[in-house]
Structure formats: structure tokens, C-alpha cells
Interface confidence: low
């Protein structure tokens, strides 16, 4: 799977969209999970309504919401009041039985609030231990990675 970068400003909301084939994933609940390390598990953050027909209803877990347009084939995740610790690699998943298919890998980057007194150029990245190779990225706001570029800069 390619990785898509979504950039948001600290303190604001970030919307992540995950398109999918609505016919292929018909009847399946969806989930948003956070990748724990390069080879680690993907820890569930929030999932759509238990009744698939009600997937359009927004469900919250803390500051993260999920809603699913099952006809149009778009899963939308909202991260409210974005914080530096929200930066990292996530997955949109389609659930079937005890298994999960990855719909999209998402790299969330948190930009400093330009109205804040800190350097407006600040950008938080996941730690170096979470490096993922060869991310082909569709830019979502202002920046896209070059093919083959590692999404996390080396830290000194």
C-alpha cells in the first residue's frame, strides 16, 4: 500500500478521507487504527457503528471521529484539536470477521499553529523508530514526498 500524507495544524481539526470500492466492501464495518512501530500491530482507535446500515452516524472515541459513506465509498476520520502526539502512521481498515483489510495507509503530520509564538516552520514527525520505506504519497494539503523518500527525517 502507498502511504498518503495528511497535514494538519496543531489545535485545529484534520479530516482524513479513505476512498474504497463500495461494492467490494459492501456490508463491512470500517476502523481507524494507529500503527505501533514498523512491524507492530495496528491499535484500534475507533470503528464505525456496530450496525452497518448506521455507518453514516459519526462515532467518537476521545477526539477522533469516524463516519462512513457506504454508497459513495468514502471513510472519513476527523481528528479534533490536533496535537503533536497525534503525528504518526495510521490505517483505514475494512473489517470482515476477525480479519481486517487495509484500505489506506495514512501518515499524519502536525504543523505548528502559525498564530502560536513558536517557529511557524515547526513540523512534528513520528519518531525515527517508526520509519517506513518507500512511501508513495498523494499530498493532501501542502506537501508530497518524492518517490522513495523516507517519510521521517533522520534525527540527530
Amino acid at each position: 500500500h502507498n502511504t498518503t500524507v495528511f497535514q494538519g495544524v496543531a489545535g485545529q481539526s484534520l479530516q482524513v478521507s479513505c476512498p474504497y470500492d463500495s461494492m467490494k466492501h459492501w456490508g463491512r464495518r470500517k476502523a481507524w487504527c494507529r500503527q505501533l512501530g514498523e512491524k507492530g500491530p495496528c491499535q484500534r482507535v475507533v470503528s464505525t457503528h456496530n450496525l452497518w446500515l448506521l455507518s453514516f452516524l459519526r462515532r467518537w472515541n476521545g477526539s477522533t471521529a469516524i463516519t462512513d459513506d457506504t454508497l459513495g465509498g468514502t471513510l472519513t476520520i476527523t481528528l479534533r484539536n490536533l496535537q503533536p502526539h497525534d503525528a504518526g502512521l495510521y490505517q483505514c481498515q475494512s473489517l470482515h470477521g476477525s480479519e481486517a483489510d487495509t484500505l489506506r495507509k495514512v501518515l499524519v503530520e502536525v504543523l505548528a499553529d502559525p498564530l502560536d509564538h513558536r517557529d511557524a516552520g515547526d513540523l512534528w514527525f513520528p519518531g525515527e523508530s517508526e520509519s517506513f520505506e518507500d512511501a508513495h504519497v498523494e499530498h493532501s494539503i501542502s506537501r508530497s514526498l518524492l518517490e522513495g523518500e523516507i517519510p521521517f527525517p533522520p534525527t540527530s
Partner: antibody
Framework: QVQLVQSGAEVKKPGASVKVSCKAS????????MNWVRQAPGQGLEWIGR????????NYAQKFQGRVTMTADTSTSTVYMELSSLRSEDTAVYYC????????????????WGQGTLVTVSS | DVVMTQTPLSLSVTPGQPASISCRSS???????????LHWYLQKPGQSPQLLIY???NRFSGVPDRFSGSGSGTDFTLKISRVEAEDVGVYYC?????????FGQGTKLEIK
Amino acid sequence: QVQLVQSGAEVKKPGASVKVSCKASGYAFSSSWMNWVRQAPGQGLEWIGRIYPGDGDTNYAQKFQGRVTMTADTSTSTVYMELSSLRSEDTAVYYCARLLRNQPGESYAMDYWGQGTLVTVSS
Amino acid sequence: DVVMTQTPLSLSVTPGQPASISCRSSQSLVHSNGYTYLHWYLQKPGQSPQLLIYKVSNRFSGVPDRFSGSGSGTDFTLKISRVEAEDVGVYYCSQSTRVPYTFGQGTKLEIK
């Protein structure tokens, strides 16, 4: 109307491979999962795996992992199931079967089946 | 894998009489979306299997209303209210809640 037409019977030697085809018509081929199920002589039904022709996504039963390959050609609405390293226990009738989709929710039942392809593995 | 167990394995019924086949799964067949993917198939002699009942109790198109399905969780039943000569064959229950999909061993229905 929906039709699934499979290729003819095959006789293979142990260790060889076989590739069975299933040509679909009468429905939106790309957006329905296709299954492969087999039935050994006088035995019950055994699920081998499935393929989604729209993007080639596959799921295989653990038992066949590494020996089975399913592919789809959307230009001809045909799915293929190749089984390698054949042994005598693989002698069976192989069926392709479409997954029914209904609202609300997908039923994940196999509503249309091919006529079956007998594969005989014998030295 | 989910193990499907059918009882009885064979059944001999007089035309016009009812018949019942039981199917038990080794784990719950309720999918994460709330639906239960338990289906019944009939394989008539020399033919490919055909779908009778899907999602526990829904008759597939063209299936006579003498066939009915019921159950929940791990216990399911297929009933034929009045058996006819054309109903002979092997009946299979099957689950598609979890991959790999699995089938019961089959129940052979004969006419007395």
C-alpha cells in the same frame, strides 16, 4: 442471466500444475467476489479461496496457501485457478461460484455455480 | 477455522412428511456488521450445488416456500415442511462470516 462456464476435464501427473478457467456473463463481473470450491469423489465441499476481479485481491484457505494462485482477466470476464504440486488427494471436481450481494449487507452466499471441472491426478 | 457440524448425516423421509436438518458451528457466526452469514445449499445427484437459504432465513429466488431456515449464534436449522421427490440430494450448511469459508459434512436426503 448469470452464467459461469468452466473449462473441460483435466488429467495430470503428480507434481504437475493445473489451471482451470471460469468465464462469467450476465452480471457486473468486476464487482463481485468469485470463489473456488472443490469436491473430492464422494466427499463434501471444501472452500479453496476467492478473488475480487476488480483489483485482483485474493484470500486463500491456509491449506492451499503457497500452492494456489487465482487470477482474473476483466477483458474476457474470466477467472482462473491454478493449483501446483498436484498430488492424488487433489483429484476432485473444482467449482467456481459467485458471491451473491444483496441489500442490506452483503449475503456472502454463493448464488451461481459453474458446472464443475473434474481434475484427475494420477501417475 | 470455524467447524460446521450437521445432524443427521442421512435422512429417509416419506413424501409429504416434514424433514429437519440441524447445523452447529464451533463459534458464533455473527459478523462484525451484525449479520449472520449462515447459508444452506442443496446438491442434487450429478449437479452443482445450488443456493437454498442465505443469511439464516432468506429464501433464494425460485426456492419453494416449503423450505425455511432458522437459528442464531451457533445453532441453525433447515426445515422442509412437506418433502417432495425432487428434494433428494445432499444438503450442506455453510458459513461465510469468517475466512476461510467452511461447510458442514452434508446431510443426504432420500425418499422412502
